[in-house]
Amino acid sequence: AQEVQQSPHCTTVPVGASVNITCSTSGGLRGIYLRQLGPQPQDIIYYEDGVVPTTDRRFRGRIDFSGSQDNLTITMHRLQLSDTGTYTCQAITEVNVYGSGTLVLVTEEQSQGWHRCSDAPPRASALPAPPTGSALPDPQTASALPDPPAASALP
């Protein structure tokens, strides 16, 4: 069955830095989206071989592409705190196929201690389990950010 391999699972970067997200499939795509999950999922880019990519205005001028729609690397530049979130690749094929998601944590330098990625992929709730029918629902919920450690009481 068609599937999307997506990497990395999670990445922590300082404000102003760049991040690469790679979406790989076995081919046979019409095109591929990168979408930011949340209460209202938002398209970030749509890429189709031989067609000028479409990019959300929030990221215009901050995104580069390399490869082809079957093996696409998306580079997001000049990251802002508001870019923090879970991004998923979605392949347009006969049925909907989703990547596992990439949690991007954009941090201010001093807070990187607790804004850290674990080795685990984004939590499973970020992508719904497919129903018994052939069409998958739109992914709805984003992975939550890790909770900051509880402040220790002052002496």
């Epitope: 979408r35 398209d43 479409t54 959300d56 347009i92 069409a135 739109d138």
Partner: nanobody, 122 residues
């Protein structure tokens, strides 16, 4: 140029079936929710069925529930309306409609097909 080409209409007897198709070109089909509307002579255009852009959900006007089925193929840029147990009151011009919802890169854009006539009569 953007095009939605509706086809599949015709004359059918009550109780019969018909399948409509709408082939899209000139825009990114998967970025749009797709709907079928119908307009009977002298009446306003009414929504019949809608399917979300990735096919996750569909909705139907009460009078067609259980008889009509909307589906889409994003790999072929086509939306379908399968109509069963047709009644004379289903007679109308049927139009397909594309509308980009919130969250889509093309939010706010919408397009209409030229329509295909369905006549249910004995």
């Amino acid at each position: 140029a953007v095009q939605l080409v509706d086809s599949g209409g015709g004359l059918v007897q009550p109780g019969g079936s018909l399948g409509l198709s709408c082939a899209a070109s000139g825009f990114t089909f998967s970025g749009f929710d797709m709907s079928w509307y119908r307009q009977a002579p002298g009446k306003e255009r009414m929504l019949v069925a809608t399917i979300t852009r990735f096919g996750g959900s569909s909705n139907y006007e009460d009078s067609v529930k259980g008889r009509f089925t909307i589906s889409r193929d994003n790999a072929r840029d086509t939306v379908y309306l399968q109509m069963n147990s047709l009644k004379p009151e289903d007679t109308a011009m049927y139009y397909c409609h594309a509308e980009a919802p919130a969250g889509s890169l093309w939010f706010g854009n919408n397009y209409w097909g030229q329509g295909t006539q369905v006549t249910v009569s004995s």
